[in-house]
């Protein structure tokens, strides 16, 4: 129930990549505004995005305080221009979000190949260690800092002249692979958290090929 000119938010959805975390919901407001609250299971509610006409709220600053916590959000609906007004039960209408545990659920952003270097029949491929919005001691932590041993990378590589792909895996941000002399190769990488049940893999990085600027070739 509630006042006749407000409707409860619905389809509350967490959109999160590399811990940049936004709560989205419907409907687009007509004569109403929204306020969002977020809490851990054992914590107090904290209000964000006060009396907004947006249908999204950036909650990154709250969830990065402890990415291993489980969070719950709720969206309150108020009549526009009369935010003191409440529903028939004496409280504004609100809807709860699903629970969200950033460490287990944030999407892995598309990785980037930082560089590759060929020395003879070996190629070293380095993946950029992307910065997240998680802080420690006033510095932003990288994806590797946050996920540590839980994060691996998969490398897909193939000869420019063929379509047959090979794969390699690493627990670091570097690969060392064997290649055929005189052949050019193309590379793409994917971030993976094998222990997850959801959002286990990122999208593939842009393809980088030997003979282009990113790499370095040294014949030995």
């Amino acid at each position: 129930s509630g006042t006749t000119n407000t409707v409860a938010a619905y389809n509350l959805t967490w959109k999160s990549t590399n811990f940049k975390t936004i709560l989205e919901w419907e409907p687009k407001p007509v004569n109403q505004v929204y306020t969002v609250q977020i809490s851990t299971k054992s914590g107090d509610w904290k209000s964000k995005c006060f009396y907004t006409t947006d249908t999204e709220c950036d909650l990154t600053d709250e969830i990065v305080k402890d990415v291993k916590q489980t969070y719950l959000a709720r969206v309150f609906s108020y009549p526009a221009g009369n935010v003191e007004s409440t529903g028939s039960a004496g409280e504004p209408l609100y809807e709860n979000s699903p629970e969200f545990t950033p460490y287990l659920e944030t999407n892995l952003g598309q990785p980037t190949i930082q560089s590759f270097e060929q020395v003879g029949t070996k190629v070293n491929v380095t993946v950029e260690d992307e910065r997240t919005l998680v802080r420690r001691n006033n510095t932003f932590l990288s994806l590797r800092d946050v996920f540590g041993k839980d994060l691996i990378y998969t490398l897909y590589y193939w000869k420019s002249s063929s379509s047959g792909k090979k794969t390699a895996k690493t627990n670091t941000n570097e690969f060392l692979i064997d290649v055929d002399k005189g052949e050019n190769y193309c590379f793409s990488v994917q971030a993976v958290i094998p222990s997850r049940t959801v959002n286990r893999k990122s999208t593939d990085s842009p393809v980088e090929c030997m003979g282009q600027e990113k790499g370095e070739f040294r014949e030995i």
Partner: antibody
Framework: QVQLQESGAEVKKPGASVKVSCKAS????????IEWVRQAPGQGLEWMGE????????KYNEKFKGRVTMTRDTSTSTVYMELSSLRSEDTAVYYC??????????????WGQGTLVTVSS | QAVVTQEPSLTVSPGGTVTLTCRSS?????????ANWVQEKPGHGFKGLIS???NRGPWTTARFSGSILGDKAVLTLWGAHAEDEADYFC?????????FGGGTKLTVL
């Protein structure tokens, strides 16, 4: 505060199985790996395996593969370690442990009090 | 499986500095080994001092410091106290499993 409470001492016969429990409290149970480590009398520490309660993902020490099973019950925030085909060399104190996470850390910060398992005929 | 080696025993004078090392049979220890240092005191059980190479636990005094020195993980204790007398174990991560060292018995004498 973080606590890991293990089950009581067990005496088992060779060939039997033992199931040790580790009840966690004071933190988000699903997000932290629980490690199992044992210490035989007068010996050092030996890692047995780990489980991430949120997904039930496990990794086991090759030495124990086929004999060890780690499970969890999210409703009671409890992790279990079952070791089968017991032999006298399995007599040890069995510990569960959890890391201290502050942006990034992995391993063995918080420890249970240990469960003594004695294998004797 | 890798073998992790520690000094079996070390002695330090009260107020002195001591360095405990943790070597890997597979080569140089790196940050990808997420070196851990665990303290065992009789009657007190186990307590993690350092995890992820250099991250102190909330209870770990600043007198303990973890680092990588050359090809090994190192635990340095400055200004040793009598209560630091204990067994210290290191553990290293190898892609999909942990391996513990044999432990170092530290005597404060």
């Amino acid at each position: 505060q973080v606590q890991l409470q293990e089950s009581g001492a067990e005496v088992k016969k060779p060939g039997a199985s033992v199931k040790v429990s580790c009840k966690a409290s004071g933190y988000t149970f699903s997000s932290y790996w629980i490690e199992w480590v044992r210490q035989a009398p007068g010996q050092g520490l030996e890692w047995m395996g780990e489980i991430l309660p949120g997904s039930a993902s496990t990794k086991y020490n090759e030495k124990f593969k086929g004999r060890v099973t780690m499970t969890r019950d999210t409703s009671t925030s409890t992790v279990y370690m079952e070791l089968s085909s017991l032999r006298s060399e399995d007599t040890a104190v069995y510990y569960c442990a959890r890391d201290y996470y502050y942006g990034s850390s992995y391993g063995f910060a918080y420890w249970g009090q240990g469960t003594l398992v004695t294998v004797s005929s | 499986q890798a073998v992790v080696t520690q000094e079996p025993s070390l002695t330090v004078s009260p107020g002195g500095t001591v360095t405990l090392t943790c070597r890997s049979s597979t080569g140089a220890v790196t940050t990808s080994n997420y070196a851990n240092w665990v303290q065992e005191k009789p009657g007190h059980g186990f307590k993690g001092l350092i995890s992820g190479t250099n991250n102190r636990g909330p209870w770990t005094t600043a007198r303990f410091s973890g680092s990588i020195l050359g090809d090994k993980a190192v635990l340095t204790l400055w200004g040793a106290h009598a209560e630091d007398e204990a067994d210290y174990f290191c553990a290293l991560w190898y892609s999909n499993h942990w391996v513990f060292g044999g432990g170092t018995k530290l005597t404060v004498l």
